[in-house]
Amino acid sequence: EVEKTACPSGKKAREIDESLIFYKKWELEACVDAALLATQMDRVNAIPFTYEQLDVLKHKLDELYPQGYPESVIQHLGYLFLKMSPEDIRKWNVTSLETLKALLEVNKGHEMSPQVATLIDRFVKGRGQLDKDTLDTLTAFYPGYLCSLSPEELSSVPPSSIWAVRPQDLDTCDPRQLDVLYPKARLAFQNMNGSEYFVKIQSFLGGAPTEDLKALSQQNVSMDLATFMKLRTDAVLPLTVAEVQKLLGPHVEGLKAEERHRPVRDWILRQRQDDLDTLGLGLQGGIPNGYLVLDLSMQEALS
């Protein structure tokens, strides 16, 4: 806490300017009017205040707005935003996308801080859902943002917002997240033609069921191996050798290099060796000729 002391004669600040960097902590506290600071917050960003001086400025705003800062002040916080705690930010009501952008800009190029995470959480909860403009903004600043959300949180993303998602935004998503996002993407892109549809849906395919993969195999999509390796194992296992060949097109040769990795390894174990041999890739580990395959999962379902 900074002690309350009278401002020395002639030192009362008439505006927020660079002369204030020469003020001691107690002088800043005594000589800068909090209301003046609030109206001239945008100037702080251009003044090289020390960390200690920033603490004093924050303290002044906290006293002026004990229930939380108004958006007019929040929008111009600049690097003072980084002195805020998550507890401070939980008091705010940020509704403007411009305010969100201004504060994200302060932390641009760095990983998401606790302050930023709290700010985004407050903003999204206030809006009720992750609309396209918000998602556009968040993924522009934090490509991994979408994958930081739980499947429950992702369920509030409307299909229309999926248009804002870029392939790199999904790089760190796990299968549970893609399970939620894939149906939304399928809905969002449903009116596109074959090749355009595949380009858009490709990065979401880690959540695709077997029947959709079978359908894609009939469309000459030439899926690359990187995409194939991210598919759900349980979705890949029922595919026939012919379907995988059609799905991958010229990329089918890449299966050899991946034969020891999932889902390729598990898929090979489910195929007849005869069928695998037709690919001419030397894939080994299939079911030997003459063996009968019993689908026990089907048997259990029937009993």
């Epitope: 251009a46 960390y51 920033l54 980084l82 190029g109 760095h110």
Partner: antibody, heavy 119, light 107 residues
Framework: QVQLVESGGGVVQPGRSLRLSCAAS????????MNWVRQAPGKGLEWVAV????????YYADSVKGRFTISRDNSKNTLYLQMNSLRAEDTAVYYC????????????WGQGTLVTVSS | DIQMTQSPSTLSASVGDRVTITCRAS??????LAWYQQKPGKAPKLLIY???SLESGVPSRFSGSGSGTEFTLTISNLQPDDFATFYC?????????FGQGTKVEIK
């Protein structure tokens, strides 16, 4: 007068860890930001990381992100750099340096400690 | 991250010469630029901050100018003690980046 003294350097194998320390005196340590800057043999200066006065914000160079952690103990006037998964290219003299605010330069530097990553 | 490019990388000069080193930022950094001097085996020393402000105790023959993306360090009357490597550094973003350095050597 301001004094910064680094320690903890030495020879370490690739993949191993090392922790550097920087003991500060002559100023109010808890008021100022602290940085690590390194210099590979015969090369230029490379900024590594910064930590704000109260430890609330930490920023890293892309080359060390996820491997190095900057921290401080204001009660001991000491800055730390925890270096994990060390690589040959991390071989350098490591300097600690002070800044007084987000828009302040590095006004005081230690003399550095040499870290050699080699098998 | 903001990239800093210094030129030249080496500069040969004589005592009494006027020497100019330039530094270019990959994006605007306003005036948040510092210049440092480093001698072999020693820590860097701050010379100039905020593009043109002289650090206390630094001789007045050192001066800096520029803003935005283009900056210069000038040594007006090179002294024997000035032969060293000089670095620019931006501190506009929390990732503070250095230029690659300019070595000023005796001609």
């Amino acid at each position: 007068q301001v004094q910064l003294v680094e320690s903890g350097g030495g020879v370490v194998q690739p993949g191993r860890s090392l922790r550097l320390s920087c003991a500060a005196s002559g100023f109010t340590f808890s008021s100022d930001g602290m940085n690590w800057v390194r210099q590979a043999p015969g090369k230029g200066l490379e900024w590594v990381a910064v930590i704000w006065n109260d430890g609330s914000n930490k920023y890293y160079a892309d080359s060390v992100k996820g491997r190095f952690t900057i921290s401080r103990d204001n009660s001991k006037n000491t800055l730390y750099l925890q270096m994990n998964s060390l690589r040959a290219e991390d071989t350098a003299v490591y300097y600690c340096a002070r800044d007084r605010g987000p828009l302040w330069p590095l006004d005081y530097w230690g003399q550095g400690t040499l870290v050699t990553v080699s098998s | 991250d903001i990239q800093m490019t210094q030129s030249p990388s080496t500069l040969s000069a004589s005592v009494g010469d006027r020497v100019t080193i330039t530094c270019r930022a990959s994006q605007s950094i306003s005036r948040w630029l510092a210049w440092y001097q480093q001698k072999p085996g020693k820590a860097p020393k701050l010379l100039i901050y905020k593009a043109s402000s002289l650090e206390s105790g630094v001789p007045s023959r050192f001066s800096g100018s520029g803003s935005g993306t283009e900056f210069t360090l000038t040594i007006s009357n090179l002294q024997p003690d000035d032969f060293a490597t000089f670095y620019c550094q931006q501190y506009n973003s929390y990732s503070r980046t250095f230029g690659q350095g300019t070595k000023v050597e005796i001609k």
